[in-house]
């Protein structure tokens, strides 16, 4: 039986009931390499409680479909004698980048998990040449996820005091030229996450081939390496890597870009302070307020729910949005598709699309950025989820009684980009974490 | 205050049945993840089984299919269902809860002998 989503075949994942104290090792391809698991298990859970494993999902028990993978095992999940067995199920969603899997459930017989990726995707549209895995968990289980810093277009120019080259970089995946035929990266080559611009020449110094490491709390590391043998002409002989570290700051504080730190014969350094290396926790909620010590923030977006059926409008040319967050009101527009975010074309108001869901919310604030993300709408052509994502922007004098408005700024492969000034969105600091 | 106390040990014959029970005051108990362990003389502490907040049940190898663990969250109770009883179950048992928002809850162990 082949492989169903062989992108993703290349490694084990991790995925964390963080409830329970338990960590799922997962590989969807072969088996995971853990003695206590036995040979055959493809998915592997380690209770850090009782330092015990437990196969629940077996490589030879498998079975597939476009979006489904199931591992079952021959382990009988009660005691009654019942014929049912411990299982493992993996719902697979598109994404626009490889993602990670997220554990959703556990019942006394199946595990549940949820993977967006573009494994699952219906088109090649987001595909990478190259992509490894960009999260990672820290030793108290913890989550750190650098997948929203990936660019499927464009690259990060690297802070450097080189007036003759520039480096570019991507993260966790090779540069998509493609996508942005206007740049100085259109030389780079195919496949290159390091992309170093001399004049009108560009050399790959580095391809993605491991997934993210943690080093030690706070601080994660991505390794880049060029893969062919062909040595560069400037690098002394040596072949060209590029090592990436993405620091936590020790408080809050807006972005940074990444920095060099040490070169020398086409080994290249790079420091990158930002928020999205501390864990996710920090950075994410699942409501519209992000509070307490552990986020050293204080927001709350919840006045700007709607109450009465009423919406925010949006207007965005051949559409009109209609907007209710941070709650579970209907949208008239958009009966019982349960939708913060809906989308109806204006020459044809029959044409209504969900453009995110109000149980798929996250509210993140990260270097700085405020932003309210709706996603699980209505699946594009590519096999997408239609998703939205607000910006919100602190402004003390926002009409409205100081809520303000929402504004479409555009949408890109069925994302919804909008920009919302807000006296709500001011946000409150606290002492560092 | 968070507590948990166990009930239902004693002396069993080998083949014997027991029922302990672990009822919690102080916690949200459906929120919690329930372990059983014991400790029998002059050893350490071991795992028995585990019951996830979600459902979940795992045994140690030992009492795999003898033991049953289950929790009625009504009653805020978990209970393990020991049948088959050996000489070697002889220990104290604990119980255990944990959540991520608690430090992790023993209680005070019930004994129980399998002698004939």
């Known amino acids: 039986q082949a492989a169903p989503f062989p992108e993703l075949c290349s490694y084990t994942w991790e995925a964390v009931d963080t409830k329970n104290n338990v960590l799922y090792k997962i590989n969807i391809c072969g088996s995971v390499d853990i003695v206590q698991c036995g040979p055959s298990s493809a998915v592997c859970m380690h209770d850090l409680k009782t330092r015990t494993y437990h196969s629940v999902g077996d490589s030879v028990l498998r079975s597939a479909t476009r979006s489904l993978l199931e591992f079952n095992t021959t382990v009988s999940c009660d005691q009654q004698g019942t014929n049912h067995r411990v299982q493992s199920s993996i719902a697979f969603l598109c994404g626009k980048t490889l993602g990670t899997p997220e554990f959703v459930t556990a019942t006394e017989c199946v595990h549940y998990f949820e993977w967006r990726t573009t494994a699952a995707c219906k088109k090649d549209i987001f595909k990478a040449n190259k992509e490894v895995p960009c999260y990672v968990f820290d030793e108290e289980l913890r989550k750190h996820d650098l997948n929203p810093l990936i660019k499927l277009s464009g690259a990060y120019l690297v802070d450097d005091s080189d007036p003759d080259t520039s480096l570019f970089i991507n993260v966790c995946r090779d540069i998509d030229t493609l996508r942005d035929p206007g740049s100085q990266l259109r030389a780079c080559p195919p496949g290159t996450a390091a992309c170093l611009v001399r004049g009108h020449q560009a050399f790959d110094v580095g391809q993605p081939r491991d997934g993210l490491k943690v080093v030690r709390k706070d601080r994660l590391v991505l390794s880049y390496v060029r893969e062919e043998a062909g040595k560069l002409d400037f690098c002394d002989g040596h072949s060209p890597a590029v090592t990436i570290t993405f620091v936590c700051p020790s408080e809050r504080r807006e972005g940074t870009i990444p920095k060099l730190t040490a070169k020398s014969n086409c080994r290249y350094e790079i420091e990158w302070i930002t928020e999205y290396a501390c864990h996710r926790d920090y950075l994410e909620s699942k409501t519209c307020s992000l509070s307490g010590e552990q986020q050293d923030v204080s927001i709350d977006l919840t006045p700007l729910a709607q109450s009465g059926g009423s919406s925010y409008i949006s207007d965005g040319k051949e559409y009109l949005f209609y907007l209710n967050v941070c709650g579970e009101t209907e949208i008239q527009f958009c009966n019982k598709k349960q939708a913060a975010v809906c989308q109806v074309k204006k020459s044809d108001t029959s044409q209504v699309k969900a453009a995110g869901r109000y149980h798929n919310q996250t509210l993140r604030y990260s270097d700085g950025d405020l932003t309210l993300i709706y996603f699980g709408g209505d699946e594009c052509s590519s096999g997408f989820q239609r998703m939205s994502v607000i910006n919100f922007e602190c402004n003390k004098t926002a009409g409205n009684d100081g809520k303000g408005t929402p504004v479409f700024t555009g949408e890109v492969d069925c994302t919804y980009e909008f920009t919302w000034d807000t006296e709500y969105a001011c946000v409150h600091h606290h002492h560092h974490h | 205050q968070v507590q948990l106390q166990e009930s239902g040990g004693g002396l069993v014959q080998p083949g014997g049945s027991l029922r302990l029970s672990c009822a919690a005051s102080?916690?949200?108990?459906?929120?919690?993840?329930m372990d059983w362990y014991r400790q029998a003389p002059g050893k350490q502490r071991e795992w028995v089984a585990t019951?996830?907040?979600?459902?979940?049940?795992t045994y140690a190898d030992s009492v795999k299919g003898r033991f049953t663990i289950s929790r009625d969250n009504t009653k805020n109770t978990v209970y393990l269902r020991m049948n088959s009883l050996k000489p070697e179950d002889t220990a104290v048992y604990y119980c255990?809860?944990?959540?991520?928002?608690?430090?992790?809850?023993w209680g005070q162990g019930t004994q129980v002998t399998v002698s004939s």
């Open positions: 255990k809860a944990s959540s991520p928002v608690l430090n992790d809850i």
């Open positions: 019951l996830a907040s979600y459902g979940w049940k």
């Open positions: 102080g916690i949200i108990f459906s929120d919690n993840r």
